[in-house]
């Protein structure tokens, strides 16, 4: 089955610059399919923009300004790129790549979409580091004792732009856990968001990870925030693993004598 | 030009109570096109639900039913037993791929219908209230309450800033909420909640324990701990980025 990944969840540009949005195709040979690009402007319907067919033919929607969009594909990396020239505020939108995928039954096809990339235009000079800054909250003793469950909370602050994705996993597992989150909130010129995960008592002795995707993450990779195992009988960090690490790889643990 | 027009911009649904979305086609006969339905959830993920010819996306066949009313020129999508996972914006779209003759392989979309999911009516449930702390940050966790109406108060004489609470549906079909704030005196912050004309305090849930039960660190003790495993995370979180871990004792 075809799968589309758009690695950039957002792309922030200043006016008149060029934006390049990527779409990675897997599960199907890119040179054997057509890739379509759609945009969803705020308050408008999702609109077809341009497509590139298996033989490289480009088709643009009528009424789309000439010279504004360019589409290509790179078979070696199985990638299609949408280039938006001379960005202006009317280009603010979420851009989706899509492709027709054949179903098992002959003649049945569906169009699958990538997760989208939001194009953001700014005229602000922001601080050098506008990646999400995490703060972690561990379960309260009251919750673990009374409810035989514990809630981890992952707070992310001082990031720009506002587009962010958060999910949770147990260590050594790729299963995404069911979590809950608040709305993204504006604080001065940046944003904050929090997500929380409630796990049953039997999972409290496992390490959990809050995984954050953001345009300005260091080196462009997902940020993983580690939540240590919790002992419900003795609240301390699990010392069983003793890997040596660089000093700058450590987390600072503040043990405070607080109630609740 | 073809236009697809949803019947409603917003449709509130209750968990487990069937709901119907409708989308009419203007300017053309709906029978000349294939109708598709998509759902966009938080984070912009566009998921395929249904396409004419009885094609359903993975996991949708049991809980969704697509239909066309040729006489009324409209498409219908039924959500048979909505759950909180079904919240999102639903889009109808049309194409003529595979119809032969004049065909379009692009999709023409209508505007979205926002489906909001509410728990079904149920007996009132009092919340549990817990406080979590880290440095100047305090979170008040309010669990498993019904109905939704609630006021969460973080009690402190030295507030730096507070944020609007997040109120969401819990997996059990009630509500959970979290309110966050920053306080100079975070150690003394408690949380009180007004719900159903009653007040619930976080202190009501504090556990009285023997000193043997827990590690009791010295007030000022800060320790550096190695990371828990040899696995190198994709992005290392440095100490300046994590406002410390807080073990509440």
């Amino acid at each position: 089955a075809g799968h589309l990944e758009q690695p950039q969840i957002s792309s922030t540009k200043t006016l008149s610059k060029t934006a390049r949005l990527e779409c990675v195709v897997s599960g199907i040979t890119i040179s054997a399919t057509s890739v379509y690009w759609y945009r969803e402007r705020p308050g408008e319907v999702i609109q077809f923009l341009v497509s590139i067919s298996y033989d490289g033919t480009v088709r643009k929607e009528s009424g789309i300004p000439s010279g504004k969009f360019e589409v290509d594909r790179i078979p070696e990396t199985s990638t299609s790129t949408l280039t938006i020239h001379n960005v202006e505020k009317q280009d603010i939108a979420t851009y989706y790549c899509a492709l027709w995928e054949a179903q098992q039954e002959l003649g049945k096809k569906i169009k699958v979409f990538g997760p989208g990339t939001k194009l953001i235009i700014t005229d602000k000079q922001l601080d050098a580091d506008v990646s999400p800054k995490p703060t972690i909250f561990l379960p309260s003793i009251a919750e673990t004792k009374l409810q035989k469950a514990g809630t981890y909370l992952c707070l992310l602050e001082k990031f720009f732009p506002d587009v962010i994705k958060i999910h949770w996993q147990e260590k050594k597992s790729n299963t995404i856990l069911g979590s809950q989150e608040g709305n993204t909130m504006k604080t001065n010129d940046t944003y904050m968001k929090f997500s929380w995960l409630t796990v049953p008592e039997k999972s409290l002795d496992k390490e959990h990870r809050c995984i954050v995707r953001h345009e300005n993450n260091k080196n462009g990779v997902d940020q993983e925030i580690i939540f240590p195992p919790i002992k419900t009988d003795v609240i301390t960090m699990d010392p069983k693993d003793n890997c040596s690490k660089d000093a700058n790889d450590t987390l600072l643990l503040q043990l405070t004598n607080t109630s609740a | 030009a073809i236009e697809l027009v949803p019947e409603h911009q917003t449709v509130p649904v209750s968990i487990g109570v069937p709901a119907t979305l409708r989308c009419s086609m203007k300017g053309e006969a709906i029978g000349n096109y294939y109708i598709n339905w998509y759902r966009k959830t938080q984070g912009n993920t566009m998921t395929f639900i249904y396409r004419e010819k009885d094609i359903y996306g993975p996991g949708f066949k049991d809980n969704f039913q697509g239909d066309i009313d040729i006489a009324k020129n409209l498409a219908v999508l039924k959500i048979l037993a909505p759950s909180e996972r079904d919240e999102g914006s639903y889009y109808c779209a049309c194409d003529t791929l595979g119809m032969g003759g004049e065909y379009t392989d692009k999709l023409i979309f209508g505007k979205g219908t926002r489906v909001t999911v509410e728990p079904r009516s149920q007996p009132h449930t009092k919340p549990s209230v817990f406080v979590m702390k880290n440095g100047t940050n305090v979170a008040c966790l309010v669990k498993e309450f019904y109905p939704k109406d609630i006021r969460i108060n973080l009690v402190s004489s030295k507030k730096i800033t507070e944020f609007d609470p997040a109120i969401v549906i819990s997996p059990s079909g009630k509500y959970n909420a979290v309110k966050l704030g920053k306080y100079e005196d975070s150690n003394s912050v408690t949380c009180s909640v007004q719900h159903d004309n009653k007040t619930v305090h976080s202190t009501d849930f504090e556990v009285k324990t023997d000193s043997t039960d827990h590690v009791k660190p010295k007030e000022t003790e800060n320790t550096k701990q190695p990371s828990k495993s040899c696995h190198k995370p994709k992005a290392i979180v440095h100490t300046e980025k994590v406002n410390m871990m807080s073990l509440t004792v």
Epitope: S16, G43, E44, P65, E88, K89, I92, D123 | -
Partner: antibody, heavy 122, light 106 residues
């Protein structure tokens, strides 16, 4: 000081043409979406047309679509409105207005010209 | 097509609070703004993006927006505030103005 000065208005017969100009000064013209708004005598404001910063996008009110053409010359700091097939109901004061929202998906007009009167009458 | 509705006229005594409403479908999502226009003059922006005030606009002007209604509030209304007021929003590829409200200061 931001200034927008319209010119080119006047009396024209139904079916005739007119070209309005707007000279901008006191700000960097090129990044801004520019607009024409009109006001018939004794009536309210009616948006006519918008043009994006690099002329990629032009939008028109239904009432003028196919008859009016908006354009701009960033080198000359100028905005234009070519009005063809004029009708009596096009009689109005035409204002040139700057869109104050440079980078957001909203529109508000933070500076307006003094307006130029277009009268369509036989 | 999208429409914004305003009352044709509102009267207020000097020093009192004047409220002018503007209603339209899902207006809360559309960032309403407000203009003041005095006879023979060009419009002046007084509120944008629901509740922001351009520099030079007195603090007595404020805006709010929720659901289907945007409201322009003038607290401590002065005689000089007598004018026509227009709300405006943006829908899809169209800019829409309300019909205007004549504010009379008695």
């Amino acid at each position: 000081e931001v200034q927008l000065v319209e010119s080119g208005g006047g009396l024209v017969k139904p079916g005739g043409s007119l070209r309005l100009s707007c000279a901008a000064s006191g700000f960097t013209f090129s990044p801004y979406t520019m607009n024409w708004v009109r006001q018939a005598p004794g009536k309210g404001l009616e948006w006519v047309s918008s043009i994006s910063s690099s002329s990629s996008y032009m939008y028109y009110a239904d009432s003028v679509k196919g008859r009016f053409t908006i354009s701009r010359d960033n080198a000359k700091n100028s905005l234009y409105l070519q009005m063809n097939s004029l009708r009596a109901e096009d009689t109005a004061v035409y204002y040139c207005a700057r869109d104050g929202d440079l980078v957001g998906p909203t529109y508000y007009f933070d500076y307006w010209g003094q307006g130029t009167l277009v009268t369509v009458s036989s | 097509s999208y429409e914004l509705m305003q009352p044709p006229s509102v009267s207020v005594s000097p020093g009192q609070t004047a409220s002018i409403t503007c209603s339209g479908d899902k207006l809360g999502d559309k960032y309403a703004c407000w203009y003041q226009q005095k006879p023979g003059q060009s419009p002046v922006l007084v509120i944008y993006q629901h509740n922001k005030r351009p520099s030079g606009i007195p603090e007595r002007f404020s805006g709010s927006n929720s659901g289907k209604t945007a409201t322009l509030t003038i607290s401590g209304t002065q005689a000089m505030d007598e004018a026509d007021y227009y709300c405006q929003a943006w829908d899809s590829t169209t800019v829409v103005f309300g019909g205007g409200t004549k504010l009379t200061v008695l």
